[in-house]
Amino acid sequence: ELCDDDPPKITHATFKAVAYKEGTMLNCECKRGFRRIKSGSPYMLCTGNSSHSSWDNQCQCTSSAARNTTKQVTPQPEEQKERKTTEMQSQMQLADQVSLPGHCREPPPWENEATERIYHFVVGQTVYYQCVQGYRALHRGPAESVCKMTHGKTRWTQPQLICTGETEPSQFPGEEEPQASPDGLPESETSR
C-alpha cells in the first residue's frame, strides 16, 4: 500500500531512508536538457523474495537534443558533485552497507539524474531527519517518521525535531553540535 503523502517537512532539515521497503518506487527523473530513454521505465521498483530485495528496471537518461545516444549508468565525478555534496555521497555509502530483509538499499546514481530523487513510499517505511548544515537541533526528540495505516488512511508520524540557526550562548564559535540523526544517517530530500 502506497503512502498517500510525502513525509512531513521539518524546517532546516532533510530526511533520508536508510533502506526502502519492497513496493517503493523511485521516479526515473533526468536533469534539464535530458530525458528518459524511449524504451526506459518511468520508475524503478523495489522488489524481492524472502531472501533478497533489489531494484527492478534501470533509469537511463539521454540528451534531449540527441536522438539515440543512451548513456552508461556510471556517473562522471563532475556530475556526481553537481547532484549531491561530497559529504552526502560518503553518507550514502554508509546506507549501502545496511541490509534489512524485505528492503532495498539506496539505488546507485545514474548519469544525468535529476537533482532531487522522488520516491513513492509504502506503509511501514521509516525516514530519518537531521538538521542541515549551519543549523543545529534545538530539540532532539524522535527524529524519524513512519508511514502508518490508520482507519483505512495512511499518515506519517510527526518527527519531534526542531532545527534552529540561533546559536546557544554556551556554544563556542567553531564548536559543532552533533547532528540529530542516529548513527550519522545520510541525507536526501530537502525539507524546504
Partner: antibody, heavy 115, light 107 residues
Framework: QVQLVQSGAEVKKPGASLKISCKGS????????MHWVRQAPGQGLEWIGV????????IYAQKFQGRATMTVDTSTSTAYLELSSLRSEDTAVYYC????????WGQGTTVTVSS | DIQMTQSPSSLSASVGDRVTITCRAS??????LEWYQQKPGKAPKLLIY???TLAEGVPSRFSGSGSGTDFTLTISSLQPEDFATYYC?????????FGQGTKLEIK
C-alpha cells in the same frame, strides 16, 4: 493518556516575578519540546517561546527576551515559565503546549497583575 | 516575523452549513501550518497539522488545505459543538505566530 497539568491561578503586584509549572504525564517527557503561549483577556494567542525538554535549550519571542525564563526538570517531567518585572499587560492565561504541532495543551494558568 | 492574517474575523452560520475560514501568511511557509479550535474558558485544541493532516480524534467534517501563503479550514457540515473561535498558526520558524482568530457564531 497524555496530560499537561498546570499550576493554579496567581495574583501578583506590578514589578513582581512569577513562576508557573506544567507537568507532563502519559508520554516520554523528553521526546517533545514544550512551548509557552499566553492569551490576554478577550485577545488572541501569543507565542512566548519554546524549550527543549531534552537539553534545556530555549528560544524566546523577542518581546519576552530577557524577561521570561523557561526551564525544565526532567526528574519530575515538569516545565517552568518564570516572568519577571510584571506589569498589568502581563495579565493573561498562560498555556504550555507540547511538541512541534502543539498537539496537547495544559488547562491554562490565570495570572492577574494588579496593584 | 511572519504575520498570519485570518478572514473573516467573525462569522455567523447555521447548523448544517458548510463553512470556510482562510489564513494568509506574509511569506511562503510551505505546509507548516496548524489550525486550532478554542471554546470559552478552555485551552485551544489541535484540529489540523501540516496544513491538511487531521489530528487524532478530530471529526472528518474538518479539513485543511493550502500551501505556501494561502490556507483554508473547512467544516463541511456545522454541528452545534463547532461554534467556537478558530486560530491558524505557523511553525515554519521561530517565532511561531498565530492568526488573530475567527469567531464562529450561531446565526
Amino acid at each position: 493518556q497524555v496530560q499537561l497539568v498546570q499550576s493554579g491561578a496567581e495574583v501578583k503586584k506590578p514589578g513582581a516575578s512569577l513562576k508557573i509549572s506544567c507537568k507532563g504525564s502519559g508520554y516520554t517527557f523528553t521526546d517533545y519540546a514544550m512551548h509557552w503561549v499566553r492569551q490576554a483577556p478577550g485577545q488572541g494567542l501569543e507565542w512566548i517561546g519554546v524549550i527543549s525538554t531534552y537539553s534545556g535549550d530555549a528560544i524566546y519571542a523577542q518581546k519576552f527576551q530577557g524577561r521570561a525564563t523557561m526551564t525544565v526538570d526532567t526528574s519530575t517531567s515538569t516545565a517552568y515559565l518564570e516572568l519577571s518585572s510584571l506589569r498589568s499587560e502581563d495579565t493573561a492565561v498562560y498555556y504550555c503546549a507540547r511538541g512541534v504541532t502543539f498537539d496537547y495543551w495544559g488547562q491554562g494558568t490565570t495570572v492577574t497583575v494588579s496593584s | 516575523d511572519i504575520q498570519m492574517t485570518q478572514s473573516p474575523s467573525s462569522l455567523s452560520a447555521s447548523v448544517g452549513d458548510r463553512v470556510t475560514i482562510t489564513c494568509r501568511a506574509s511569506q511562503d511557509i510551505s505546509n507548516y501550518l496548524e489550525w486550532y479550535q478554542q471554546k470559552p474558558g478552555k485551552a485551544p485544541k489541535l484540529l489540523i497539522y501540516n496544513a491538511k493532516t487531521l489530528a487524532e480524534g478530530v471529526p472528518s467534517r474538518f479539513s485543511g488545505s493550502g500551501s505556501g501563503t494561502d490556507f483554508t479550514l473547512t467544516i463541511s457540515s456545522l454541528q452545534p459543538e463547532d461554534f467556537a473561535t478558530y486560530y491558524c498558526q505557523h511553525h515554519y520558524d521561530t517565532p511561531y505566530t498565530f492568526g488573530q482568530g475567527t469567531k464562529l457564531e450561531i446565526k
